[in-house]
Interface confidence: low
Amino acid sequence: RKIPKVGHTFFQKPESCPPVPGGSMKLDIGIINENQRVSMSRNIESRSTSPWNYTVTWDPNRYPSEVVQAQCRNLGCINAQGKEDISMNSVPIQQETLVVRRKHQGCSVSFQLEKVLVTVGCTCVTPVIHHVQ
Amino acid sequence: GITIPRNPGCPNSEDKNFPRTVMVNLNIHNRNTNTNPKRSSDYYNRSTSPWNLHRNEDPERYPSVIWEAKCRHLGCINADGNVDYHMNSVPIQQEILVLRREPPHCPNSFRLEKILVSVGCTCVTPIVHHVA
């Protein structure tokens, strides 16, 4: 069965749910925890053995319009002498987030949810070595 | 998507702000990307600042499963495979947006929620405070 039969609805208070047209959902974009802030250690992007830079992408038809992406500065990692060690690899760490995309169709506008992959920083890893026979 | 008529005359001026409430299509673009970090890479084991991944599940949220990283050590793994306490493993945190069912249990009414997740760990030089 595609949808559970009446009496087996998963939702405990369907009468209190707002009516929504088929094929869509109602989304309040007033963000819960809007003022929450990241409490990361200071300047870790510069102090890391796999340092990274940040760039901001901006799109007025996306909510939120600003998305910050990290890029690893080096292929290798920074050793104790401050030099790049290419026997190790700086690799990006990624995380998915949701955004709302606004699309214009003639004089109408529609909204679509989209998963976006954000690079949040870099870590230093031992490389995988493939031995050729 | 679900189309919403614009102002009469369809002016060229772009609406700078998104409306507080929008109707969105149920189909999420890129929804089928791999969301399990254990399957997408083994960086959490190969890193000099390795981490464990903890699964957090909440059916009132989309996505219902989110993975949280916890650094395994205070220090970092050196070339000999030992923990070097002259360096620090620190979590990389990121704010992400998820959907929260609002009112609770409603099938197709959501609100955006900002949550803070630790995505992985990185090895950093410590900040040394010299006492005068």
Partner: nanobody, 119 residues
Framework: EVQLVESGGGLVQPGGSLRLSCAAS????????MYWVRQAPGKGLEWVAS????????YYVDSVKGRFTISRDNAKKSLFLQMNSLRAEDTAVYYC????????????WGQGTLVTVSS
């Protein structure tokens, strides 16, 4: 056609045990997260437990943690729920469910198996 068929329910005394099974067909079982949900008399459905595609991770609602164990056998396309230390409040129809979809939690359900815990 997708089918989920539960079995193993019945009448059991408080403190007793039951093992529920769910036989799946019509889809690639090993590709989906699977769930057990339950509906107590006169109540809405409650999510009970879930298990990842490869069985590597399980998750439980607080009220059953330490008493229930979810498992799966991908080769046999089967989902299981081992229920120990059963309580009267565990009385419900138990359903297995497949996947996650917006806006619903689950896109396919079984017909359910009744578990009654009573002395």
């Amino acid at each position: 056609e997708v089918q989920l068929v539960e079995s193993g329910g019945g009448l059991v005394q408080p403190g007793g045990s039951l093992r529920l099974s769910c036989a799946a067909s019509g889809f690639t079982f090993s590709s989906y997260r699977m769930y057990w949900v339950r509906q107590a008399p006169g109540k809405g459905l409650e999510w009970v437990a879930s298990i990842e595609q490869d069985g590597s991770e399980e998750y439980y609602v607080d009220s059953v943690k330490g008493r229930f164990t979810i498992s799966r056998d991908n080769a046999k396309k089967s989902l299981f729920l081992q229920m120990n230390s059963l309580r009267a409040e565990d009385t419900a129809v138990y359903y297995c469910a497949k996947g996650e979809i917006l806006p619903l939690y689950f896109d396919y359900w079984g017909q359910g198996t009744l578990v009654t815990v009573s002395s």
